[in-house]
Interface confidence: low
């Protein structure tokens, strides 16, 4: 009998493992999962199990490769493939992701449901368990405050409009004796907007004033630090290749000095780099590393550390460019903390143009995504695109960040 009980436990564990991995690689999560998308590019879609077991929710289930492989080999979904040497898995190339058309987005929206009334200490597992017999669920998004506290409400995506409709239309649903408010996501937004109309202008104005004050402080600090950057400007000029771009400069100086700003447009024959430290040092290091001959795309380049009036003028221009860039972002109504209109090289840890794991690091960009994170799905370096902690927007706007928008 005990053996039978063990078998049942194992089967339950295997089902959970399959469900978790198939969620990670599923239609809902994968397009939003920056880290996994990066991994998939690296080795024909194969992701080492070594990396998979660092994902929090899988890690809690098992870290045993054999158990994972065994579980996936029994999966009915046939979404995943296991490599010959059983050390890697991938989403089967025969099951490509659906194209994200307007029609597809609309379909997802129509099977998304809002549920409110859970205790704020409920865990994702509690909610999953409660939803178990409520229809096929593809994604659960626990809504959170800015400080990551669960609000007691969730968004759920069902596999079909029919199952979502059936769920919404089931009367008297409770979670542990508590009545739940259940609405289609769209209806929830409509209701919320209606409630907000009264105090919207006032709240908006207050938020805007606070935001502007905060932003001004940030800008002032930034301007001040820029004005202190005497000796940090490096001019480059020459018969540059038309394809020369800022990325080339970033690569050239990647180990020699941190670039704060690059004033250069593709096709131009000259530009200016603003370093965090002294430009002379960065130039010296880069020259040493390149046997004294510092070229861009095999073209000779004249490098000159700016001084005096020329430097002041260049600094003034950079300050103006940054200001203009900030204003552009402000006019888009977006919270902005960057340093420029794409003229800035990728910063360490920004994830831009970089593989997001480095050797010994065991915390992955996906850890938060696959655990319980804020309602807007923004994790790591991606900043929150909204000012208020409880402000909702339609799904189409919400999912602008590339990071995951779900828990599971």
């Amino acid at each position: 009998m005990a053996e039978n009980g063990d078998n049942e436990k194992m089967a339950a564990l295997e089902a959970k493992i399959c469900h978790q991995i198939e969620y990670y690689f599923g239609d809902f999560n994968l397009p939003r999962d920056k880290f996994l998308k990066e991994q998939i590019k690296l080795d024909e879609g194969w992701v080492p199990l070594e990396i998979m077991i660092k994902f929090n929710r899988l890690n809690r289930l098992t870290t045993d490769f054999n158990v994972i492989v065994e579980a996936l080999s029994k999966s009915k979904a046939e979404l995943m493939e296991i490599s010959e040497d059983k050390t890697k898995i991938r989403r089967s190339p025969s099951k490509p992701l659906p194209e994200v058309t307007d029609e597809y987005k609309n379909d997802v929206k129509n099977r998304s449901v809002y549920i409110k009334g859970f205790p704020t200490d409920a865990t994702l597992d509690d909610i999953k368990e409660w939803l178990e017999d409520k229809g096929q669920v593809l994604n659960i998004q626990m809504r959170r405050t800015l400080h990551k506290a669960f609000k007691g409400s969730i968004f759920v995506v069902f596999d079909s409009i029919e199952s979502a409709k059936k769920f919404v239309e089931t009367p008297g649903q409770k979670y542990k004796e508590t009545d739940l408010l259940i609405l289609f996501k769209d209806d929830y937004f409509a209701k919320k907007n209606e409630e907000r109309k009264q105090n919207k202008v006032e709240a908006k104005l207050r938020a805007k004033q606070e935001q502007e004050a905060k932003q001004k402080l940030e800008e002032d600090a930034e301007m001040k630090s820029l004005e202190e950057k005497i000796g940090c400007l490096l001019k480059f000029s020459g018969d540059l290749d038309d394809q020369t771009c800022r990325e080339d400069l970033h690569i050239l100086f990647s180990n020699h000095g941190e670039i704060k700003w690059i004033d250069f447009v593709r096709g131009a024959k000259e530009g200016i780099i603003l370093f965090k430290e002294k430009a002379k040092e960065a130039l010296g290091k880069a020259k040493d590393a390149n046997n004294g001959n510092l070229q861009l795309r095999n073209k000779e380049v004249t490098w000159e550390v700016l001084e005096g009036e020329v430097e002041k003028e260049a600094l003034k221009k950079i300050i103006e460019d940054q200001q203009e860039s900030l204003n552009k972002w402000k006019s888009k109504g977006r919270r902005f903390k960057g340093k420029g209109k794409g003229n800035k090289a990728a910063q360490p840890g920004s994830g831009k143009g970089k593989v997001q794991f480095q050797g010994k690091k065991t915390k992955f960009a996906s850890d938060d995504e696959h655990d319980e994170h804020d309602e807007n799905g923004a994790t790591g370096p991606v900043k929150r695109a909204r000012e208020e902690t409880d402000k909702e927007e339609p799904a189409s706007k919400q999912q602008k960040t590339e990071n995951g928008a779900g828990d599971q």
Partner: antibody, heavy 119, light 105 residues
Framework: QVKLEESGPELVKPGAPVKISCKTS????????IYWVKQRPGQGLEWIGY????????AYNQKFKDKATLTADNPSNTAYMQLSSLTSEDSAVYLC????????????WGQGTTLTVSS | QIVLTQSPAIMSASPGEKVTMTCSAS?????MYWYQQKSGTSPKRWIY???KLASGVPARFSGSGSGTSYSLTISSMEAEDAATYYC????????FGTGTKLEVK
């Protein structure tokens, strides 16, 4: 367009090392794997190893682990393969190839470098 | 590791003739890839994902198969098709077949 250009033919004495280059153009070097493949006269193709210039990661076919060392110079968009302690068995054409970004194949190849090991 | 065996090793065909060469895997694989290599040149991607033709490959070529058995077919041989064809699979690492040399009669 995408191009992979390998260095010229090499005649090397046994025991010496050799370094072959594969200069790429027409695409973002750091976004694609470069693989090296060995082909002996009248024989098939044998995978040696790869480098991913994006993070410097490398992997080798066990058979070539102590023979080949792969490096990349990102500013010049060039991949290199150094072969050590050469013997006549190493005489072959060495090809570099770019692996498709999400494909399971090699989409572009270098023209090959002929290595002759002889005293 | 998987071993890919191509047969025949050498074959010849007259222009207009139908040609089929096979690639047998020692254990099941998901996809097969084919390359064409002419004497003194590097290989060219020819067929990918078992049956898709790479750009510039004439429509007379086709690929098929599954599991352990795959094939490349030329519906009507032309002189320019004379070359060595290699199959290749990719599980954790690339593995090439032994090659089939196709000559024109």
């Amino acid at each position: 367009q995408v191009k992979l250009e390998e260095s010229g033919p090499e005649l090397v004495k046994p025991g010496a090392p050799v370094k072959i280059s594969c200069k790429t153009s027409g695409y973002t070097f750091t976004n694609y794997y470069i693989y090296w493949v060995k082909q002996r006269p009248g024989q098939g193709l044998e995978w040696i190893g790869y480098i991913y210039p994006g993070n410097g990661g490398t992997a080798y076919n066990q058979k070539f682990k102590d023979k080949a060392t792969l490096t990349a110079d990102n500013p010049s968009n060039t991949a290199y393969m150094q072969l050590s302690s050469l013997t006549s068995e190493d005489s072959a054409v060495y090809l570099c190839a770019r692996r498709g970004a999400l494909g399971y194949y090699f989409d572009y190849w270098g023209q090959g470098t002929t290595l002759t090991v002889s005293s | 590791q998987i071993v890919l065996t191509q047969s025949p090793a050498i074959m010849s065909a007259s222009p207009g003739e139908k040609v089929t060469m096979t690639c047998s895997a020692s254990s099941s694989v998901s996809y097969m890839y084919w390359y064409q290599q002419k004497s003194g040149t590097s290989p060219k991607r020819w067929i990918y994902d078992t049956s898709k033709l790479a750009s510039g490959v004439p429509a007379r070529f086709s690929g098929s198969g599954s599991g352990t058995s795959y094939s490349l077919t030329i519906s009507s041989m032309e002189a320019e098709d004379a070359a060595t064809y290699y199959c290749q699979q990719w599980s954790s690492n690339p593995q090439f077949g032994t090659g089939t040399k196709l000559e024109v009669k």
